[in-house]
């Protein structure tokens, strides 16, 4: 069956050192437990997180994301997943692409992460 992949239409904001959550869903919603679900970073398709065959595939991750990501799957039965990235870095800023693959059918959605410095402030006057 065909579907669309939908992500946030506005940039997601996070502070350096915090965690951030990137949500993504399919429409119409359906059980995605048996699908391949992942996030990568264009333009070089570096794997941020990959879920396949019912489990997370840590070995495929880009080194800079190893140990920093978690796929929240409490709503995967409805086709909704969220990628949590811990200890956000400035280098995380930019584009992320979420994809769902069902057999040979794949769709994806782009989203943008803005990273801000929690200690940045403008002096008065």
């Amino acid at each position: 069956g065909q579907f669309r992949v939908i992500g946030p239409r506005h940039p997601i904001r996070a502070l350096v050192g915090d965690e951030v959550e990137l949500p993504c869903r399919i429409s119409p919603g359906k059980n995605a437990t048996g699908m391949e679900v992942g996030w990568y970073r264009p333009p070089f398709s570096r794997v941020v997180h990959l879920y396949r065959n019912g489990k997370d595939q840590d070995g495929d991750q880009a080194p800079e994301y190893r140990g920093r990501t978690e796929l929240l799957k409490d709503a995967i039965g409805e086709g909704k997943v969220t990628l949590r990235i811990r200890n956000v870095r400035f280098s995380d800023e930019g584009g992320f692409t979420c994809f769902f693959r069902d057999h040979s059918y794949q769709e994806e959605a782009a989203m943008e992460l803005k990273v801000e410095d929690p200690f940045y402030w403008v002096s008065p006057g």
Epitope: I6, H10, R13, E21, R25, T82
Partner: antibody, heavy 119, light 106 residues
């Protein structure tokens, strides 16, 4: 199963404030968008504003800007809506509702909180 | 602000009828439209999202169509449980609801 449980009915005097709570259970609270929608007696639905707890900043409908404050406490998975300078026209049922992220359909709703403003 | 106009305001129908409710947006909202059902004293219930996707657990007699500015909710064969008020809602830019359509027994 996601559930949104709201605080009980309130009776308030004109000019006062009311704070309604919405406690979420089942699911990831922090990245979902919690909206507040009100319905005056016999009237339609009106979006007041919303918040994504993990980001902390709220967005408000222009009509309520300056009079409504929406906050969230991630530690207790609870969202709050405070409406100040109450007038009789604010008598309504106030609902919290969840969207999967900002600007999404609202798939789960609280049971509603009746706020009556009367002198 | 995006305005949503629903028609008709009230609709009288009988069990088994095919019922269509229309919603028009003041500007294009792509397919960012939802339909809700509300019964007296109850919270609204999501029926359709993304203009045409059926929410889990909602009977298949409900369907949605349209994109841009014109949308419809269709109930293929009205059941006794379907007498209620229906609202459309855009979520292209914040949120706006239509004024509602009450479906009552003829």
């Amino acid at each position: 199963q996601v559930q949104l449980v709201q605080s009980g009915a309130e009776v308030k005097k004109p000019g006062s404030s009311v704070k309604v709570s919405c406690k979420a259970s089942g699911g990831t609270f922090s990245s979902y968008a919690i909206s507040w929608v009100r319905q005056a007696p016999g009237q339609g639905l009106e979006w007041m504003g919303g918040i994504i707890p993990i980001f902390g900043t709220a967005n408000y409908a222009q009509k309520f800007q300056g009079r409504v404050t929406i906050t969230a406490d991630k530690s207790t998975s609870t969202a709050y809506m405070e409406l100040s300078s109450l007038r009789s026209e604010d008598t309504a049922v106030y609902y919290c509702a969840r969207g999967y992220f900002s600007e999404e359909a609202m798939d789960y709703w609280g049971q509603g909180t009746t706020v009556t403003v009367s002198s | 602000d995006i305005q949503m106009t629903q028609s008709p305001s009230t609709l009288s129908a009988s069990v088994g009828d095919r019922v269509t409710i229309t919603c028009r947006a003041s500007q294009s909202i792509s397919s960012w439209l939802a339909w809700y059902q509300q019964k007296p004293g109850k919270a609204p219930k999501l029926l359709i999202y993304d203009a045409s996707s059926l929410e889990s657990g909602v009977p298949s007699r409900f369907s949605g169509s349209g994109s841009g500015t014109e949308f419809t909710l269709t109930i293929s064969s009205l059941q006794p449980d379907d007498f209620a008020t229906y609202y459309c809602q855009q979520y292209d830019s914040y949120y706006t609801f239509g004024q509602g359509t009450k479906v009552e027994i003829k």
